[in-house]
Interface confidence: low
C-alpha cells in the first residue's frame, strides 16, 4: 500500500482488518506454588494469578491449569520471567575444595502443547548455570520471541525447580502473550 | 473475521481502525546520568536521549523529566535493559576470607506512576545478586512485558545504584515501549 | 479515533490501513556454525536456520548470507538470544591465585546494515563479563527493542566468539523480527 | 532538490580561528553525513572528517584533529566547522558534501585566506 | 592510511577518443559490510567536485553512460568511451571504506 492514497473506495487489503484492542492478550503474574506431581524427565509447570493485580486475560484468551489457551490462529509474541533465589549451591563448596564440579544450574522452558501432536514442543528456553558463592543468590531468566499458534495450542511455563522461584512479587515473575 | 471476505461495505469491526504507523511508540537511549536526590527508599530514575542516535518518540507519546507520558488507553508492551558494571563487590573479599555475606545486588524496576493514586506501581523488576570476583564485572539486565495503561500514566526506569549503570553506549542501555 | 462510531462512510484514518498477517515477519533458529572469517575487531555474524522447526519468514521478509532483510520501511520488533557454554575462563584460574584480573566476556550484537552507509550500526548490546568457576558453564543473554528501519536495511546477529555458541537446540538460540 | 550553501569566502589573520557554515537543503538533514574536504591552490582533495547531525558523531582524519572541529545545529539544517590556530598552510578552499554510499551533493566551496 | 595511486597524471586525449583512468590502493577497501565504497569525482575548474561513479561501478543520476567504472579489490578503472568537450577536467579517484577516507591526486583530462 506504500504510496497509496487512502480511501475507503479503493482500499486494497488482502485479508480482514481487524480492531487492534479485539485481539487475544494475556498477562500472567507468579503465585505461591504448591508442590506438584509432574512426569520423571519433565519440568514442572508453574501456575499463575490471571486478574488480580497487573494480570489479566481478554479477548477469548483464557488461563487454565497452567496453560493459557489460544483461541485463534496467527503470529504470537510470547514472553516470561521467571525470579530464581536459592542458597549457596553445593558446587561452591566442592570448588573451593578444588574440585570442579559440573554446575547446578536453573531452567525455565515456555512450552507449546498441540493435543493432536503427542509430545509437548519447547519453543523457549533460557538455561543458566550457578556457582554462586554468596550466601544467598537471586536472578532472574528473561525469554520472548515470536511463535506461529494454531487456534487450540495451549501455552505453559516449566522451571528446572520450582522451589527456587522468586513467588514474592507480581513483578520479578510473569508470563504473557499477544496475539500481533 | 476469520475467512471473511473483505470489502468496505461489509467490514464488520468492533471497534474503530487505525493505521499502525499511527500508534504512540517511544525507544529511549542512555545518556550520562547527573546525581540526583531521590526519596529515602525509593530508587533512582533514570534519565534519557528521547531524540539523538536511534532514540524516538512519536505519535504523542512524549518523554520529558525522567518520564514517558502514555498518551491514550491501551495495551503497551515495554521495555527496558540496563547494562551494569562495577568493580569487585566487597561481597567476594568477605567471601574470600571465609565469611558468606549477603551478596551486593543490581536491580532494575520499569514504574508505573498515575497522578491519581499515590503509590506509583511496579510493573516489571529485574534483580539479581552481584558476587564477581574478578576486578572488573558487567551485566545486562533485560526487562520486557505488556501492561494495560490509562491515557496519562507516566512510565519510569529506577535502577538500585545509578553509579552502576553504563551510559557509554546507546545500544546497552535502553527503555522503550508502544502501542499495540 | 478514539470513540468513533466505525462506518466506511466516515472512517477517518491517516494511513493505509493493512491486515495485520499481511506484514513482515521472521524468526530464525539456531545451525550449527561454520568457521567464518571476519574482518579484525568485528564479531563474527551468526547464520540461522530460517524455515524448518520453529523457523519462518513470511511477507518479503527473506533470509540470506547471515541477514534479515527488511521488505518495507516501518518500526520493527527486533530480538535474539544468545545461549553461550564454555570451559572454566582463565580469569578464574588467575583469580584463584590471588591475582585479580580483567574478566573474560560474552557479547551479542544486533547490527544494521545500510547499504548506503558505510559503517554499520550497532542497535542492540548484551555484554556480560564471565569470571565463571565450576568446570562448565551456560547461560543467554537476551535483547529486544522497537526500531525504525528502512526498506533494504539489512540485520545481523553478531557474538564476540562463535565457537561458544550453543547450537545444540532451537529454543536456545534464536534471533526474529516482526513489523509494528 | 538537494542543496548545500556555503558561507562566503574568508580573509583572516594568522593565529585566528574562522567558522565556516553550510546550510542543507532538499532532504532530512540529520539523516545523512556531513563531510568535510580541504583542497589548496592547484592541488588535490584532502578528507578532513564527518559529523552525523543526529547524535552529533564525529569521525576525524588524524591530520585534522585539533585543527578542525566539525558541529551542526539541527534546528537550521547547518553544519559547521571551525578552524583554529591558522597559517597560510590553510589557505584552502573548504568544500561540504553529504555522504550517502558516496559524495553525492556538494556545496560550491569556502575559499579562506589566511594572510597578515 | 589508505594510499589511492591514480595514473596517468595527465592524460590527453582526442575528441571522440576513448579514455582510460587506473586508480590503485594501498590495501583492499572491501569494507566490513561486503561493498566497496569506491568513487569517481571530475571537478572542473573553480567548481565543486561532481560525483560520477560511485561503489565502483554505478552511475549516478543524470550521469552519461558514456561513463562506466569497474575494479575490485585494489585495482579500479573509470573509462569514457568518447570522450566530448564537457568531461574535459580533473578526475579524482576516492575510497570510503576506512577511515581516514582518501582520494587520488588526480589525472587531468585535457584535450591532446
Known amino acids: 500500500l506504500k504510496g497509496q492514497e487512502f480511501a475507503p473506495s479503493h482500499q486494497q487489503v488482502y485479508a480482514p482488518l481487524r480492531a487492534d484492542g479485539d485481539k487475544p492478550r494475556a498477562h500472567l503474574t507468579v503465585v505461591r506454588q504448591t508442590p506438584t506431581q509432574h512426569f520423571k524427565n519433565q519440568f514442572p509447570a508453574l501456575h499463575w494469578e490471571h486478574e488480580l493485580g497487573l494480570a489479566f486475560t481478554k479477548n477469548r484468551m483464557n488461563y487454565t491449569n497452567k496453560f493459557l489457551l489460544i483461541p485463534e490462529s496467527g503470529d504470537y509474541f510470547i514472553y516470561s520471567q521467571v525470579t530464581f533465589r536459592g542458597m549457596t549451591s553445593e558446587c561452591s563448596e566442592i570448588r573451593q575444595a578444588g574440585r570442579p564440579n559440573k554446575p547446578d544450574s536453573i531452567t525455565v522452558v515456555i512450552t507449546k502443547v498441540t493435543d493432536s501432536y503427542p509430545e509437548p514442543t519447547q519453543l523457549l528456553m533460557g538455561t543458566k548455570s550457578v556457582c554462586e558463592v554468596g550466601s544467598n543468590w537471586f536472578q532472574p531468566i528473561y525469554l520472548g520471541a515470536m511463535f506461529s499458534l494454531q487456534e487450540g495450542d495451549k501455552l505453559m511455563v516449566n522451571v528446572s525447580d520450582i522451589s527456587l522461584v522468586d513467588y514474592t512479587k507480581e513483578d520479578k515473575t510473569f508470563f504473557g502473550a499477544f496475539l500481533l | 473475521l476469520k475467512g471473511q471476505e473483505f470489502a468496505p461495505s461489509h467490514q464488520q469491526v468492533y471497534a474503530p481502525l487505525r493505521a499502525d504507523g499511527d500508534k504512540p511508540r517511544a525507544h529511549l537511549t542512555v545518556v550520562r546520568q547527573t546525581p540526583t536526590q531521590h526519596f529515602k527508599n525509593q530508587f533512582p530514575a533514570l534519565h534519557w536521549e528521547h531524540e539523538l542516535g536511534l532514540a524516538f518518540t512519536k505519535n504523542r507519546m512524549n518523554y520529558t523529566n525522567k518520564f514517558l507520558l502514555i498518551p491514550e488507553s491501551g495495551d503497551y508492551f515495554i521495555y527496558s535493559q540496563v547494562t551494569f558494571r562495577g568493580m569487585t563487590s566487597e561481597c567476594s573479599e568477605i567471601r574470600q576470607a571465609g565469611r558468606p555475606n549477603k551478596p551486593d545486588s543490581i536491580t532494575v524496576v520499569i514504574t508505573k506512576v498515575t497522578d491519581s493514586y499515590p503509590e506509583p506501581t511496579q510493573l516489571l523488576m529485574g534483580t539479581k545478586s552481584v558476587c564477581e570476583v574478578g576486578s572488573n564485572w558487567f551485566q545486562p539486565i533485560y526487562l520486557g512485558a505488556m501492561f494495560s495503561l490509562q491515557e496519562g500514566d507516566k512510565l519510569m526506569v529506577n535502577v538500585s545504584d545509578i553509579s552502576l549503570v553504563d551510559y557509554t553506549k546507546e545500544d546497552k542501555t535502553f527503555f522503550g515501549a508502544f502501542l499495540l | 479515533l478514539k470513540g468513533q462510531e466505525f462506518a466506511p462512510s466516515h472512517q477517518q484514518v491517516y494511513a493505509p490501513l493493512r491486515a495485520d498477517g499481511d506484514k513482515p515477519r521472521a524468526h530464525l533458529t539456531v545451525v550449527r556454525q561454520t568457521p567464518t572469517q571476519h574482518f579484525k575487531n568485528q564479531f563474527p555474524a551468526l547464520h540461522w536456520e530460517h524455515e524448518l522447526g520453529l523457523a519462518f519468514t513470511k511477507n518479503r521478509m527473506n533470509y540470506t548470507n547471515k541477514f534479515l532483510l527488511i521488505p518495507e520501511s516501518g518500526d520493527y520488533f527486533i530480538y535474539s538470544q544468545v545461549t553461550f557454554r564454555g570451559m572454566t575462563s582463565e580469569c578464574s584460574e588467575i583469580r584463584q591465585a590471588g591475582r585479580p584480573n580483567k574478566p573474560d566476556s560474552i557479547t551479542v550484537v544486533i547490527t544494521k546494515v545500510t547499504d548506503s552507509y558505510p559503517e554499520p550500526t550497532q542497535l542492540l548490546m548484551g555484554t556480560k563479563s564471565v569470571c565463571e568457576v565450576g568446570s562448565n558453564w551456560f547461560q543467554p543473554i537476551y535483547l529486544g527493542a522497537m526500531f525504525s528501519l528502512q526498506e533494504g536495511d539489512k540485520l545481523m546477529v553478531n557474538v564476540s566468539d562463535i565457537s561458544l555458541v550453543d547450537y545444540t537446540k532451537e529454543d536456545k538460540t534464536f534471533f526474529g523480527a516482526f513489523l509494528l | 532538490q538537494v542543496q548545500l550553501q556555503q558561507s562566503g569566502p574568508e580573509l583572516v589573520k594568522p593565529g585566528a580561528s574562522v567558522k565556516l557554515s553550510c546550510k542543507a537543503s532538499?532532504?532530512?538533514?540529520?539523516?545523512?553525513?556531513i563531510n568535510w574536504v580541504k583542497q589548496r591552490p592547484g592541488q588535490g582533495l584532502e578528507w578532513i572528517g564527518w559529523?552525523?547531525?543526529?547524535?552529533?558523531?564525529?569521525n576525524y582524519n588524524e591530520k585534522f584533529k585539533g585543527k578542525a572541529t566539525l558541529t551542526v545545529d539541527t534546528s537550521s539544517s547547518t553544519a559547521y566547522m571551525d578552524l583554529h590556530s591558522l597559517t597560510s598552510e590553510d589557505s584552502a578552499v573548504y568544500f561540504c558534501?553529504?555522504?550517502?554510499?558516496?559524495?553525492?551533493?556538494w556545496g560550491q566551496g569556502t575559499t579562506l585566506t589566511v594572510s597578515s | 592510511d589508505v594510499v589511492m595511486t591514480q595514473t596517468p597524471l595527465s592524460l590527453p586525449v582526442s575528441l571522440g577518443d576513448q579514455a582510460s583512468i587506473s586508480c590503485r590502493s594501498s590495501?583492499?577497501?572491501?569494507?566490513?559490510?561486503?561493498?566497496?565504497?569506491l568513487e569517481w569525482y571530475l571537478q572542473k575548474p573553480g567548481q565543486s567536485p561532481k560525483l560520477l561513479i560511485y561503489?565502483?561501478?554505478n552511475r549516478f543520476s543524470g550521469v552519461p553512460d558514456r561513463f562506466s567504472g569497474s575494479g575490485s579489490g585494489t585495482d579500479f578503472t573509470l573509462k569514457i568511451s568518447r570522450v566530448e568537450a564537457e568531461d574535459l577536467g580533473v578526475y579524482y579517484c576516492f575510497q570510503g571504506s576506512h577511515v581516514p577516507y582518501t582520494f587520488g591526486g588526480g589525472t587531468k583530462l585535457e584535450i591532446k
Open positions: 558534501a553529504r555522504y550517502t554510499s558516496s559524495l553525492d551533493y
Open positions: 532538499g532532504y532530512t538533514f540529520t539523516s545523512i553525513d
Open positions: 590495501q583492499s577497501i572491501v569494507h566490513s559490510n561486503g561493498n566497496t565504497y
Open positions: 559529523i552525523y547531525p543526529r547524535d552529533g558523531r564525529t
Open positions: 561503489k565502483v561501478s
